[in-house]
Interface confidence: medium
C-alpha cells in the first residue's frame, strides 16, 4: 500500500513538475526590466527564450521573436537545449511511468517489469529535473554577470541593431517557475526510485527440494510436510544420486525407473 502511494505521489509530483518546466520554457518573463533603476517607468521590457516583449502603461504591448539562430548568444542556445531535453525526457518518463503504476493493470505484466519501468521513469525524471534546474541557473548566471544585455545586439535578425541604452534586467517569473518545477520533477523522480525498491519482488535463494527417504518416498516442502508413499520396498536400501533430490517442479506422483535400484 505504501509502495503504491509513493509511486502514485511520485508520478503526480513529476507530472506537476514537467508541466511547470513546459510553462517556464514557453514564458516570456525570463528576464524583466529593473524598473527601480530605470528612470523610464512607463515602459516594461521582458525577454524569454524565444521572443522579447515590451509593455507600456498605456496598454500597448508588442512581442517579437528572435528571427535568427546564428546571431543569438551561445548561452541562450544552451539554455533552450537544456529545457527541451528536460521536457522530452520528462514526457518519456511520464509515458513509461503510466504503464509502471501498480494501480493500473496491463495484461499479465509482472511486478519485476513494473519495478524496472518505475526505476527507468524515476531516473528520467531526475535527469529532466536536473536539466531544467541547470538551464534556469545558466540563464540566471547570464543575468547576474550582465552577459544578457551586454549582447544587446542579439537582434541581428534585423541587421545587427545595437540598443543605444543598456537596460538592466533582473530575474523574471519564469526563472522561479523553472527552479520550482525542476525541483518537483527531481523529487518525483526520487520517489519513483524509492517506490521501485518496494515493487521489486524479493527473490528467494532456495528452491523447494524433494527428498526421497529410504523405503518410503517422502517429499519435504517448505510450509508443511507432504508425504507420498512409494510403490514397493527398497530391498537394497540404497539410493542412487540421480533420484535423490529434485526441485518442486520435478516431483512426480509415480515412481520412475531411476527412483529405485
Amino acid at each position: 500500500m505504501a509502495v503504491t502511494a509513493c509511486q502514485g505521489l511520485g508520478f503526480v509530483v513529476s507530472l506537476i513538475g514537467i508541466a511547470g518546466i513546459i510553462a517556464a520554457t514557453c514564458m516570456d518573463q525570463w528576464s524583466t526590466q529593473d524598473l527601480y533603476n530605470n528612470p523610464v517607468t512607463a515602459v516594461f521590457n521582458y525577454q524569454g527564450l524565444w521572443r522579447s516583449c515590451v509593455r507600456e502603461s498605456s496598454g500597448f504591448t508588442e512581442c517579437r521573436g528572435y528571427f535568427t539562430l546564428l546571431g543569438l548568444p551561445a548561452m541562450l542556445q544552451a539554455v533552450r537545449a537544456l529545457m527541451i531535453v528536460g521536457i522530452v525526457l520528462g514526457a518519456i518518463g511520464l509515458l513509461v511511468s503510466i504503464f509502471a503504476l501498480k494501480c493500473i493493470r496491463i495484461g499479465s505484466m509482472e511486478d519485476s517489469a513494473k519495478a524496472n519501468m518505475t526505476l527507468t521513469s524515476g531516473i528520467m525524471f531526475i535527469v529532466s529535473g536536473l536539466c531544467a534546474i541547470a538551464g534556469v541557473s545558466v540563464f540566471a548566471n547570464m543575468l547576474v554577470t550582465n552577459f544578457w544585455m551586454s549582447t544587446a545586439n542579439m537582434y541581428t535578425g534585423m541587421g545587427g541593431m545595437v540598443q543605444t541604452v543598456q537596460t538592466r534586467y533582473t530575474f523574471g517569473a519564469a526563472l522561479f517557475v523553472g527552479w520550482v518545477a525542476g525541483g518537483l520533477t527531481l523529487i518525483g523522480g526520487v520517489m519513483m526510485c524509492i517506490a521501485c525498491r518496494g515493487l521489486a519482488p524479493e527473490e528467494t535463494n532456495y528452491k523447494a527440494v524433494s527428498y526421497h527417504a529410504s523405503g518410503h518416498s517422502v517429499a519435504y516442502k517448505p510450509g508443511g510436510f507432504k508425504a507420498s508413499t512409494g510403490f514397493g520396498s527398497n530391498t537394497k536400501n540404497k539410493k542412487i544420486y540421480d533420484g535423490g533430490a529434485r526441485t518442486e517442479d520435478e516431483v512426480q506422483s509415480y515412481p520412475s525407473k531411476h527412483d529405485y535400484v
Partner: nanobody
C-alpha cells in the same frame, strides 16, 4: 551605412495638415519598428507615434491621438506621419527612428534621422 532621412516639414497654419516622410536605406526596413519623436525648442525629446515592423499595430502619444496617423510602406522603405488639426504646441523638430519595438521609450531605438522642422503658426 544606415540612413533615415526625414522630409515634408515646413510652416503651416493652426488647424492645417502636413504629411511627413522618412526614407530608410542601408537596412532591412521591414524588420524594424519605426517611430516619430519630436523636440520642441528648449524642451526634451517627446514620443509622437510608432508602428510595428509589420504595420499591424500602432502606438500613439495621448497628445496626438485622433489627429495624427502613422503608416509605412515596406515596399518603398518609407515611413509616413499624417498630421491633421495642427496646433501651435505641435511646433518642433520631428525625428524618425528605427528600433526593435514600436515603443514610446527612446532607448529602444537604435537608428535616428537628422530631423525635419515643423512650425505651426498663424
Amino acid at each position: 551605412e544606415v540612413q533615415l532621412v526625414e522630409s515634408g516639414g515646413g510652416l503651416v497654419q493652426p488647424g492645417g495638415s502636413l504629411r511627413l516622410s522618412c526614407a530608410a536605406s542601408g537596412l532591412i526596413f521591414s524588420n524594424y519598428a519605426v517611430g516619430w519623436f519630436r523636440q520642441a525648442p528648449g524642451k526634451g525629446l517627446e514620443f509622437v507615434a510608432a508602428i510595428t515592423w509589420s504595420g499591424g499595430s500602432t502606438n500613439y502619444a495621448d497628445s496626438v491621438k485622433g489627429r495624427f496617423t502613422i503608416s509605412r510602406d515596406n515596399a518603398k522603405n518609407t515611413l509616413y506621419l499624417q498630421m491633421n488639426s495642427l496646433r501651435a504646441e505641435d511646433t518642433a523638430v520631428y525625428y524618425c527612428a528605427g528600433g526593435f519595438f514600436a515603443t514610446s521609450y527612446s532607448g529602444n531605438y537604435g537608428y535616428w534621422g537628422q530631423g525635419t522642422l515643423v512650425t505651426v503658426s498663424s
